[in-house]
């Protein structure tokens, strides 16, 4: 025998107080596959979180952050603050990246300095708090006599620290 | 259903106090770090205060150190706010903010949030 649930679709739920009708879902809730037997409730944008998608009766509403938030986890479950560049968030709030270290974003963590020697290189533009050092070329080639130097590309945009 | 409420906002005036209190509900509250954010009008949301799980480990901006102490009561499920000196400038509404599951030195996110509770300072 078929079961009768399996016709509801989504949006509505078989109702066992009602000989398994199909009822729709209540208002603040949704159901967004066929054969459900109850409605989900639909999640709220509260607080941090701003409704980038209202809650229909197929599918749960969508929460971005309010700015000076970003979102973290799936489907944005969490909300973080967000710092200057040149800064982290730490346990005590932002603070600002110690020397040797920079942070070109207002998420992450500060990263250390790339270190120009490690590839031969001289420092060409010094490190802030803000921005990576710019390398150069290797100190034999600044030599008297050795042919000019091309200015090298910006050094180029590190990656998204591991949230 | 996970739930923070807030309470004990209300008028002052400078130089006053107040303590704000915010109930949990539907999770286990020990096992969270717990946040106090305020929002001035106009303005965009600010980090005031957290605390960790058992109360050891305190935090505060600092616009607020000296004059606010937050601390929690595990077995009463709540988190409080005790607002000491207050200026014109702390007017805003004051939410309570859950650490995000994984709260950790390599994320500060926040996950469930009360309604708030309006605070207004003024002579």
């Known amino acids: 025998l078929q079961d009768p649930c399996s016709n509801c679709p989504a949006g509505t739920f078989c109702d066992n107080n009602r000989n398994q009708i199909c009822s729709p879902c209540p208002p603040n809730s949704f159901s967004s596959a066929g054969g459900q037997r109850t409605c989900d409730i639909c999640r709220q944008c509260k607080g941090v979180f701003r409704t980038r998608k209202e809650c229909s009766s197929t599918s749960n509403a969508e929460c971005d952050c309010t700015p000076g938030f970003h979102c973290l986890g799936a489907g944005c479950s969490m909300c973080e603050q967000d710092c200057k560049q040149g800064q982290e968030l730490t346990k005590k709030g932002c603070k600002d990246c110690c020397f040797g270290t920079f942070n070109d974003q207002k998420r992450g963590i500060c990263r250390p300095w790339t270190n120009c020697s490690l590839d031969g290189k001289s420092v060409l533009v010094n490190g802030t708090k803000e921005r990576d050092v710019v390398c150069g070329p290797s100190p034999a080639d600044l030599s008297p006599g050795a042919s000019s130097v091309t200015p090298p590309a910006p050094a180029r945009e590190p990656g998204h620290s591991p949230q | 259903e996970v739930q923070l409420v807030e309470s004990g906002g209300g008028l002052v005036q400078p130089g006053g106090s107040l303590r704000l209190s915010c109930g949990a509900s539907?999770?286990?509250?020990?096992?969270?770090?717990m946040f106090w954010f305020r929002q001035a009008p106009g303005e965009g949301l600010e980090w005031v205060a957290n605390?960790?799980?058992?109360?050891?480990?305190?935090y505060y901006v600092d616009s607020v150190e000296g004059r606010f102490t937050i601390s929690r009561d595990n077995a009463k499920n709540s988190l409080y706010l005790q607002m000491n000196s207050l200026r014109a400038e702390d007017t805003a509404i004051y939410y309570c903010?859950?650490?995000?599951?994984?709260?950790?030195?390599?994320?500060?996110?926040?996950?469930?949030w009360g309604q708030g509770t309006t605070v207004t300072v003024s002579s």
């Open positions: 903010a859950r650490g995000g599951d994984g709260y950790s030195d390599s994320h500060y996110g926040t996950d469930v």
């Open positions: 539907g999770f286990t509250f020990s096992s969270y770090w």
């Open positions: 605390i960790n799980q058992d109360g050891s480990e305190k």
